[in-house]
């Protein structure tokens, strides 16, 4: 194959791969017809002048996972056909000016996972055909104005996992073709107004895991093509009313792990493609009418692990397509009987870990397709007559960890539970809290005759009882995977959601196995 170095492998397809710790310099002679060269996991520490001079047909060059810390400015001379260059996962702190000069065909430049301290406009001024620039995982503290001005064809720019504390509003102004901009895991505290105004073709903007406190009202107003916007794990305390108003293509918006205290009505401007909205781990205390009314295609809404104590009866107006609603681990004490009335397609609702004392009899009146209801760990003493009778698809109902009052008033619920025992799951059953002589006994098998008779009749709306027939299709218990780690504190102690084990899934999701996804 035109002379393959002994420490490399060369394929018929003009591909050369050189790997191994014994390699301390670029192997020679490299086959003159090589089109792809990979130098991986070696002990090469520097690239000297023109080591690739005789392989001018090279299209792709990967020099990754080495000890590379120094490159001579002329290292890539004569590689005018090169389209892909990766220097990722090395130990580069400095890039010499002019290093990429002459690489007129270069489309992808990967400099990620090095130790680069700065970049300058002169570094990339020759790379006019560049489409992808990866700079994530370095030590960049700032990006000078003009750094990317010559990269007018750039479509993907990754600056994540650096140490950026601020961004100049002019740094991206010439990147009109940019589709993906990633700034995640930096130290940004605010984004100046106008920063993204020139990015008219932007489809993905990743700003998660920074320290952003405020969003400018018009920050995204020029980004009409934006499809994915990641704002999670910042310090955002409020959303300007119009901040999301002009994002009609948005299909992913993450806002979890911020400091949001309130959501104003209509804050989520028309987003016909948004199917999931994750708002867990904020400080939201109430939900006003029509707060989600523009999200008519929303299928999944996660509001768990907030401080919600009040939900206005019209809070969920417009969510006609919603299938999963997670409200677990909040501060709810009461719910209006009409709060879920518009959620005709709801299949799964998680209300566990709240302070609910009672439920209106009509709370699930219009939600006939409910398959799973999580009500464990609340303050429920009883439930209204017939509250679940019309829910023919209900296959998972969690009622444990409530202070059930096992007097004669509990009989209708006890009888329903007896008939519907498979729906309660096998892990934990509801037990009586009072009277004292039956405390700890299973609500399902309790002999109510020995309990203290009721001294009052609670005024709760009730349904005409619809009997549940055992010969209708059975819906077996479909409890979550070994969910012995049910969350009881307001906020779970975790550092990084990506490391949560699978057995902890309900702590965020609070959902069940009852429907597919």
């Amino acid at each position: 194959y035109h002379g393959c170095p002994s420490e490399c492998t060369c394929s018929r397809a003009s591909q050369v791969e050189c790997t191994g710790a014994r390699i301390v310099a670029v192997p020679t002679p490299l086959p003159w017809n090589a089109m792809s060269l990979q130098i991986l996991n070696t002990h090469i520490t520097e690239l000297n002048e023109s080591p690739f001079l005789n392989i001018s047909a090279l299209i792709a060059l990967r020099i990754e996972k080495n000890e590379l810390s120094r490159i001579t400015p002329g290292a890539f001379r004569n590689l005018g056909s090169l389209r892909y260059l990766s220097l990722a996962n090395n130990k580069l702190q400095v890039l010499p000016i002019g290093l990429f000069q002459g690489l007129d065909s270069l489309e992808s430049l990967l400099l990620s996972s090095n130790q680069l301290l700065q970049i300058q406009p002169a570094h990339f001024s020759q790379c006019s055909n560049l489409k992808e620039l990866q700079l994530h995982g370095n030590h960049l503290e700032y990006i000078p104005d003009g750094a990317f001005d010559h990269l007018v064809g750039l479509t993907k720019l990754n600056l994540g996992k650096n140490s950026l504390t601020h961004i100049s509003p002019r740094v991206f102004q010439h990147l009109g073709n940019l589709q993906v901009l990633r700034l995640y895991e930096n130290r940004l505290t605010d984004i100046p107004m106008g920063t993204f105004d020139g990015l008219v073709n932007l489809q993905e903007l990743a700003l998660q895991q920074n320290q952003i406190g405020l969003l400018s009202p018009g920050l995204f107003h020029n980004n009409h093509n934006l499809q994915r916007l990641y704002l999670s794990n910042n310090h955002i305390s409020q959303l300007p009313p119009s901040v999301f108003m002009q994002l009609p293509q948005l299909n992913r918006l993450t806002l979890f792990g911020n400091s949001l205290k309130e959501l104003s009505p209509g804050i989520f401007g028309p987003m016909p493609n948004l199917r999931e909205l994750w708002l867990y781990d904020n400080h939201i205390s109430s939900l006003p009418d029509n707060v989600f009314s523009n999200l008519r295609q929303l299928q999944v809404l996660i509001l768990s692990r907030n401080q919600i104590s009040f939900i206005s009866p019209g809070a969920f107006n417009g969510l006609t397509e919603l299938r999963e609603l997670s409200l677990h681990t909040n501060a709810l004490q009461d719910l209006d009987g009409n709060v879920f009335r518009m959620l005709a397609n709801l299949q799964n609702i998680s209300l566990q870990n709240n302070r609910l004392r009672q439920l209106p009899g009509n709370i699930f009146a219009n939600v006939n397709g409910l398959m799973a209801i999580q009500l464990q760990n609340n303050q429920l003493e009883n439930l209204p007559l017939g509250i679940f009778d019309h829910l023919g698809k209900l296959c998972e109902l969690r009622l444990y960890d409530n202070p059930w009052r096992c007097d004669s008033d509990i009989l209708p619920l006890r009888n329903w539970l007896l008939l519907n025992q498979p729906r309660l799951g096998t892990d934990t059953v509801p037990v009586c809290f009072s009277p004292a002589n039956v405390r700890g006994q299973s609500l399902i098998i309790i002999n109510v005759n020995v309990a203290v008779p009721s001294v009052h009749v609670p005024e709760v709306p009730s349904y005409p009882e619809t009997p549940w027939y055992p010969d209708t299709p059975s819906y077996p218990d479909t409890t979550s995977v070994s969910s012995t780690t049910e969350l009881t504190s307001p906020v779970e102690d975790y550092t990084d959601l990506t490391t949560i084990q699978v057995t902890d899934d309900r702590s965020v999701w609070g959902m069940t196995q009852a429907q597919s996804g």
């Epitope: 199917r275 699978v502 009852a514």
Partner: antibody, heavy 119, light 110 residues
Framework: EVQLVQSGAEVKKPGSSVKVSCKAS????????IHWVKQAPGQGLEWIGL????????NYNQKFKGKATLTVDTSTTTAYMEMSSLRSEDTAVYYC????????????WGQGTTVTVSS | DIVLTQSPDSLAVSLGERATINCRAS??????????MHWYQQKPGQPPKLLIK???SLESGVPDRFSGSGSGTDFTLTISSLQAEDVAVYYC????????FGGGTKVEIK
């Protein structure tokens, strides 16, 4: 280019376990749901369950609860499906597939992993 | 679980002719906004490939001779002009509840 590359074929004894991997590339792994689907010889397709890599959250088809365990390793952008207490009826091709949203169709599939259970 | 019944089990169609595959659900898989029905093509030794999502939305890169229609319980996949490369097994899938697939329809050249 979006790719899901699965581990190679396995031959296992009844009662043993198998762990199939699915290495994702070309997309943000934590931003998509990963589904697992079974196809027994000459049979149709059967949904096993899904995992959402960002939180490790799972949903299972009741039929496969206790049989399949779905996990992810976000550092290597790899999803895993472990099948336990293998029986001859677990002989099948197992696919991983990607879904954008939870209820969306599966738009990219792995090439499949054949698991044969035989004594 | 929702049962999906495909018909016919197999179908032989001349090149350039129309092929129609039906999928009936045991209960509605539609809401006012969506029909949670998707169609896949599977060739021998290959994984399934998404053709149509949400009953009628053509997946990008799929030839426009494929189309989907229907709502509620009855859905149809149509290949307007059968090509040689369309020989495969076609599956419908619903994601309205626990995901289930139809039994498949084998399409061959007559």
């Amino acid at each position: 280019e979006v790719q899901l590359v699965q581990s190679g074929a396995e031959v296992k004894k009844p009662g043993s376990s198998v762990k199939v991997s699915c290495k994702a590339s070309g997309f943000t792994f934590t931003d998509y749901y990963i589904h697992w689907v079974k196809q027994a010889p000459g049979q149709g397709l059967e949904w096993i369950g899904l995992v959402y890599p960002y939180i490790g959250g799972t949903n299972y088809n009741q039929k496969f609860k206790g049989k399949a365990t779905l996990t992810v390793d976000t550092s290597t952008t790899t999803a895993y499906m472990e099948m336990s207490s293998l029986r001859s009826e677990d002989t099948a091709v197992y696919y991983c597939a990607r879904g954008d949203n939870k209820y969306d169709a599966m738009d990219y599939w792995g090439q499949g992993t054949t698991v044969t259970v035989s004594s | 679980d929702i049962v999906l019944t495909q018909s016919p089990d197999s179908l032989a169609v001349s090149l350039g002719e129309r092929a129609t595959i039906n999928c009936r659900a045991s209960q509605s898989v539609s809401t006012s906004s969506y029909s949670y029905m998707h169609w896949y093509q599977q060739k021998p030794g290959q994984p399934p490939k998404l053709l149509i999502k949400y009953a009628s939305s053509l997946e990008s890169g799929v030839p426009d001779r494929f189309s989907g229609s229907g709502s509620g319980t009855d859905f149809t996949l149509t290949i307007s002009s059968l090509q040689a490369e369309d020989v495969a097994v076609y599956y419908c899938e619903q994601s309205h509840e626990i995901r289930t697939f139809g039994g498949g329809t084998k399409v061959e050249i007559k």
